[in-house]
Interface confidence: low
């Protein structure tokens, strides 16, 4: 299960740049090469670095030592270098209780986005810093550290008393001058005269804690093991040259017998447990596109099979000051449209054999809500809405207008701040919603701003299905159906009855149901029925009908 830290206060901080390196890679080197900045088409950029054997030093710049998240190097290496104190040191009680560990949780962590394209440098000569991964305690990295601007070169390691022994040349006696650097920083020099020449240690003892760097050749797909010793040692069967054992096959054990004229038998038998091939691993962006605006997911994938024991493989990630010991990490609650840099490495039996850096730019976030200035109707068939656009990036607007159960939405150009709605229905309430959207890895809609208006009245449509029928010699029954469109607030039906050009009746009812009595017999009448909505009359429906002779 991947850890899902939620950094609370995300601030922009300077991310250290790192030197470019060349192939192949020693297992302990912690310098990561920079990734190129984010390209939209590629989703993310990736650089897998490999360092050449002659470039194993790690540069630490003043910036990284100023940063309280820089990690302490606590391993004991065959050539000890003074530990450089940082601000973090003053908060750490002792070497034995150093609480800065790799873990999946990051309760109080802040993940700082890189400030921009100038954060990551691939320009030669730029000041560079190392990755802040702690050196592996089992197989530590032999590093050359450049001093921080606020550090003192004479300051000793807080974790150890370093004894430097310099042998003096004397014809009769071997005198050794021992300088001990105490934790307080004072040098204690004592001279002891020893009467006998010390015996040589066994090679098994001398090289008991030897460390190895594995260098991978992508063309031959073979490893070279670089023995981290100061002198040119000899190997049984002449298997090594210049302290390097060549042509090692991945996931195979190789035995090397190490000897030197400064030590006696028995030789040191070193078992080389060769890691899997570097290209068998790929750092994959597993971020869900829907969440890519505020989350990052990175996962190491095994893209080819190998015979090494997967139990011996460990994965490490560092993003900002957040450290994880997981094959997959998920960072949440990030800022949209920000670049974040994550460094990762894979270790086999605690020997690092590959690493990669990614700069991932989080996706565009949802746009903000537009601010509606006004929306109103000034005519029966028209309405207008004006607004201010949201602050965040967006591509276009969607304007929806709803009348009763009918909903229509229009895509509007991002530069519009006003829209005239046409062909609206008179005297109808329209609810409008306006939101901005952006088409990123997915379409993200911003919050909608809402408003409503009622269109003005207009003449109603004609009544229909009008009938005129005789109920008696001098009486008529006039009926009609309501207009399809009333277009106004009220409902009133009018009937005008004309004989020749003379208006003989004018009636108004709530319903279109008129009984016209006491008409003249044997007369032609014109019946005009129309609807009035309180503001406008509709067009009349006209029928002609005659009364008959009186039957009596």
């Amino acid at each position: 299960q991947s850890p899902t830290p939620s950094p609370t206060g995300l601030t922009t901080a300077k991310m250290p740049s790192v030197p470019l390196s060349s192939d192949p890679l020693p297992t302990h080197t912690t310098a990561f090469s920079p990734a190129s900045t984010f390209e939209r088409e590629n989703d993310f950029s990736e650089t897998t670095t490999s360092l050449s054997p002659d470039n194993t030093s790690t540069q630490v710049s003043p910036d990284s030592l100023d940063n309280a998240s820089a990690f302490n190097t606590t391993g004991v290496s065959s050539v000890q270098t003074p530990h450089l104190p940082t601000h973090a040191d003053s908060q750490t009680p002792s070497a034995g209780t150093d609480t800065q560990t790799f873990s999946g949780s990051a309760a109080n962590a802040k993940l700082n986005p890189t400030p921009g394209s100038n954060a990551i440098s691939d320009v030669p000569g730029e000041r560079s810093t190392a990755s802040t991964f702690p050196t592996d305690p089992v197989s530590p990295l032999t590093t050359t550290l450049s001093l921080a601007h606020h550090s003192s070169a004479a300051l000793p390691a807080r974790t150890s008393n370093t004894t430097i022994t310099a042998n003096t040349s004397d014809a009769y006696l071997n005198a050794s001058e021992t300088t001990t650097l105490s934790p307080s920083g004072s040098a204690v020099i004592s001279t002891t005269t020893i009467a006998t020449t010390p015996s040589k240690p066994t090679c098994d003892e001398k090289y008991a804690n030897i460390t190895v760097d594995y260098l991978y050749n992508k063309e031959t797909k073979l490893f070279t093991a670089k023995l981290n010793v100061n002198e040119n040692v000899e190997c049984g069967n002449n298997t090594c040259t210049n302290n390097e054992v060549h042509n090692l096959t991945e996931c195979k054990n190789a035995s090397v017998s190490i000897s030197h004229n400064s030590c006696t038998a028995p030789d040191k038998t070193l078992i080389l447990d060769v890691p899997p091939g570097v290209e068998k691993f790929q750092l994959h962006d597993c971020t869900q596109v829907e969440k890519a605006d505020t989350t990052i997911c990175l996962k190491w994938k095994n893209i080819e099979t190998f015979t090494c024991d997967t139990q011996n493989i460990t994965y490490r990630f560092q993003c900002g000051n957040m450290i994880f010991d997981n094959k997959e990490i998920k960072l949440e609650n990030l800022e949209p449209e920000h670049e974040y840099k994550c460094d990762s490495e894979i270790l086999y039996n605690n020997h690092k054999f590959t690493n990669a850096s990614k700069i991932i730019k989080t996706d565009f976030g949802s746009p903000g809500e537009p601010q509606i200035i006004f929306c109103r109707s000034e005519a029966a068939h028209q309405g207008v809405i004006t607004w201010n656009p949201p602050q965040r990036s967006f591509h276009n607007f969607t304007l929806c207008y709803i009348k009763e159960t009918e909903k229509d939405c229009l895509n509007l150009d991002k530069n519009l701040i006003k829209y005239d709605l046409q062909n609206l229905k008179p005297y109808t309430k329209y609810v409008l919603s306006l939101h901005a959207y952006i088409i990123a890895k997915v379409q993200r809609n911003g919050s909608a701003a809402m408003c409503h208006f009622t269109t003005k009245s207009a003449p109603p449509s004609q009544v229909w299905n009008m009938t005129v029928s005789m109920t008696s010699d001098n009486s008529m029954h006039v009926k009609c159906r309501p207009p399809r469109d009333r277009n106004g607030p009220h409902e009133r039906y009018h009937l005008e009855v004309e004989a020749g050009n003379t208006l003989v009746r004018n009636e108004s009812h709530k319903n279109c149901d008129f009984r016209v009595k006491d008409l003249q017999y044997s007369t032609d009448y014109t019946f005009k029925a129309y609807f009035h909505n309180g503001d406008y009359p509709g067009e009349p429906f006209i029928l002609h009908h005659s009364t008959s002779y009186n039957s009596k």
């Epitope: 969607t398 909903k407 229509d408 088409i439």
Partner: nanobody, 124 residues
């Protein structure tokens, strides 16, 4: 801007079949793709439309049961399968993209991108 290209028109006998295609390119975010037709001397009328997200389909009464509209997301293409063709189906058939959402996708006025049209002639 969405570009639409129709194909598949031609001359067919009454009772025959044709399959029209409408390929979209450019910014292809559309809610609906519709087919309209215009017979000589008549106004352009709605034939069928499909809503991309839900696959909902809409048909004019005159073609219901004879025409089928379908879409292929991967190819950004909409098809109109026309069976049991009648002489009155003779018209120029236009493909149109509606980059809006509506409850009435039959309304021609809502469509904002149109193809050039393909001629369908049904002889008796």
């Amino acid at each position: 801007e969405v570009q639409l290209l129709e194909s598949g028109g031609g001359l067919v006998q009454a009772g025959g079949s044709l399959r029209l295609s409408c390929a979209a390119s450019g910014r292809t975010l559309t809610f609906y793709t519709g087919w309209f037709r215009q017979a000589p001397g008549k106004e352009r009328e709605f034939v069928a439309s499909i809503r991309w997200s839900g696959g909902n389909t809409y048909y004019a009464d005159s073609v219901k049961g004879r025409f089928t509209i379908s879409g292929d997301n991967a190819k950004n293409t909409v098809y109109l399968q026309m069976n049991s063709l009648k002489p009155e189906d003779t018209a120029i058939y236009y493909c149109a993209a509606l980059r809006s959402w509506t409850t009435t996708p039959q309304r021609e006025v809502l469509y904002d991108n149109w193809g050039q049209g393909t001629q369908v002639t049904v002889s008796s």
